[in-house]
Amino acid sequence: HPICEVSKVASHLEVNCDKRNLTALPPDLPKDTTILHLSENLLYTFSLATLMPYTRLTQLNLDRCELTKLQVDGTLPVLGTLDLSHNQLQSLPLLGQTLPALTVLDVSFNRLTSLPLGALRGLGELQELYLKGNELKTLPPGLLTPTPKLEKLSLANNNLTELPAGLLNGLENLDTLLLQENSLYTIPKGFFGSHLLPFAFLHGNPWLCNCEILYFRRWLQDNAENVYVWKQGVDVKAMTSNVASVQCDNSDKFPVYKYPGKGCPTLGDEGDTDLYDYYPEEDTEGDKVRATRTVVKFPTKAHTTPWGLFYSWSTASLDSQMPSSLHPTQESTKEQTTFPPRWTPNFTLHMESITFSKTPKSTTEPTPSPTTSEPVPEPAPNMTTLEPTPSPTTPEPTSEPAPSPTTPEPTSEPAPSPTTPEPTSEPAPSPTTPEPTPIPTIATSPTILVSATSLITPKSTFLTTTKPVSLLESTKKTIPELDQPPKLRGVLQGHLESSRNDPFLHPDFCCLLPL
């Protein structure tokens, strides 16, 4: 082509018209273009209708083009990725009718001040939405209702002061939420729902620590290893979880997850009864903790990091770049598992290596053993993710045999001294508090770290189990045994055929036994 560079990559005809000082679409582009780069031109206004002859177009880059207006007319039936970042758009065009197949939309670093309620109507395939670096102050409550497949949402670096309570409702596949660097002072009760959110970025907001923050405090405690700090240009391997990065603005940068909440109602962070499946604040009586339980829900598909997919042995991995243009469609069944209050098992959980089978329910009942009094360590604020092997950009192909699990150096938290545990209160008696031993991990890659995240005082008492806990015998890889502290109390049962429509535990799940 006389103006643009034409090449092919993996059967995609890629046309690069970047930095050509173009003011309009160049004429006579190849009709079979699948990827079109028009970045860093001087387009000012652009009509998507001009691209209708390019029926194979799957990716369009219009970033850094000084766009003040994008005309949406015609239809681009297979366009999956649209990059409009670093432009001057003051309103988000209604793309639904024009781009019905859109999976990735990047409108970062524009001049959006608000979004209309129906801004995303018709974008039912959208998986990634990037709105970072705009001037958004509020969001309409049902903004994301039309995008149930959303996996990544970035609202970072805006002027958001509040969030609608139901913003994330129905987003069962959401794995990455970026809310850092806004003006948020609280999180409405029930905001996060009950599904697992592996990657949340929440720092750089003026969190107001009062009784209204207790729901958020509780969520942070339960999801400590899922809260990360965003560092521009930092390699994924160096990203660390850091729940302490979420700090009270009115309390000398005190971490929200440690906010004492003195004087607040006992059940102040319970919120609506369905938030944690009847999951109240611990009510301590002397040295005992009343029976409570946590619901850990596994999303319906392989987890992804903010930087790419966690490749499942059974799921073909797709584009590892971010934003990526395509994602897996294979789903595993939704799983729900109960664990003791305020902590998740201290082992490395490899979501990509667990393939849940649609088989009749299978349960394992561990045998309880005598009570021991043990301190449960406070979450270490900084936990570094294990280095992925292989890199997300070059995973093992699914046609190759899955490698056997190996056991690398375990990633464990600093073990507190037996007699002086970090959560100060009464020192736990030495004889009954052996030092926690590291938990072995199954090395697959990449990994999600899930480790003990308890804020229960040292005098909390759990019954222990000696029998390994298995989620499902028919899984391709099972979770490592839970035979080290912290101990699991009572019986853990999993009914792994729960209905997609039932947000609560199946009746067959056994409760945690009260003391």
Epitope: V6, A10, S11, P30, D32, S317, D319, S399
Partner: antibody, heavy 118, light 113 residues
Framework: EVQLVESGGGLVQPGGSLRLSCAAS????????MSWVRQAPGKGLEWVSS???????YYPDSVLGRFTISRDNSKNTLYLQMNSLRAEDTAVYYC????????????WGQGTLVTVSS | DIVMTQSPLSLPVTPGEPASISCKSS????????????LAWYLQKPGQSPQLLIY???TRESGVPDRFSGSGSGTDFTLKISRVEAEDVGVYYC?????????FGQGTKVEIK
């Protein structure tokens, strides 16, 4: 049976021009990408140019601006117009068919020799 | 451009014995969208045009004997002949069909001892 027959090779002086043709039969020519691959005497294979079924050409840097690939679907013929020829362009030029939209070559012609020499 | 490097450049073989040729690429040929490695193998018999043996690393072309097999992922690939026959002599080329410009290895000459 798929057949690819090249013609148009010969001796040409440096700076000169030559046009190669490839007559295709035994398949729906218009549906497939086509390519030229060359092999210098005693050397390995080198891709020269491709054209998609929709007519989009692309080239390596070594021939960009000097060679032009084209096709006439009505004649089931692939062409390679070679200008500003150099001694290093001396090679056997093969016409090759791609499978679908992929870029490996499932059928090759017998080749035509182009010699650039003064 | 992606550089393809083959080894060995010459491979004397005994009929009935196995043979193996290595091909390395300067960057990954794995398309993470579909988990395919975009690598093909060709055989050019003496005095003939090249013929396709294997594409997408391990898929045998129709009519190619099953004694030929391809494997590998990312940047390291291998062509194996389980039992070499006399008709297998010639020059074997690997080619990446991942990213233009399409590039070939230097070739491995297989000859009977």
């Amino acid at each position: 049976e798929v057949q690819l027959v090249e013609s148009g090779g010969g001796l040409v002086q440096p700076g000169g021009s030559l046009r190669l043709s490839c007559a295709a039969s035994g398949f729906t020519f218009s549906s497939f990408a086509m390519s030229w691959v060359r092999q210098a005497p005693g050397k390995g294979l080198e891709w020269v140019s491709s054209i998609t079924s929709a007519g989009t050409p692309y080239y390596p840097d070594s021939v960009l601006g000097r060679f032009t690939i084209s096709r006439d679907n009505s004649k089931n013929t692939l062409y390679l117009q070679m200008n500003s020829l150099r001694a290093e362009d001396t090679a056997v030029y093969y016409c090759a068919k791609s499978r679908g939209y992929e870029d490996y070559f499932d059928y090759w012609g017998q080749g035509t020799l182009v010699t650039v020499s003064s | 451009d992606i550089v393809m490097t083959q080894s060995p450049l010459s491979l004397p073989v005994t009929p009935g014995e196995p043979a193996s040729i290595s091909c390395k690429s300067s960057q990954s040929l794995l398309n993470s969208r579909n988990q395919k490695n975009y690598l093909a193998w060709y055989l050019q018999k003496p005095g003939q045009s090249p013929q396709l043996l294997i594409y997408f690393t391990s898929t045998r072309e129709s009519g190619v004997p099953d004694r030929f097999s391809g494997s590998g992922s990312g940047t390291d690939f291998t062509l194996k002949i389980s039992r070499v026959e006399a008709e297998d002599v010639g020059v074997y080329y690997c080619q990446q069909h991942y990213s233009s410009p399409w590039t070939f290895g230097q070739g491995t000459k297989v000859e009977i001892k």
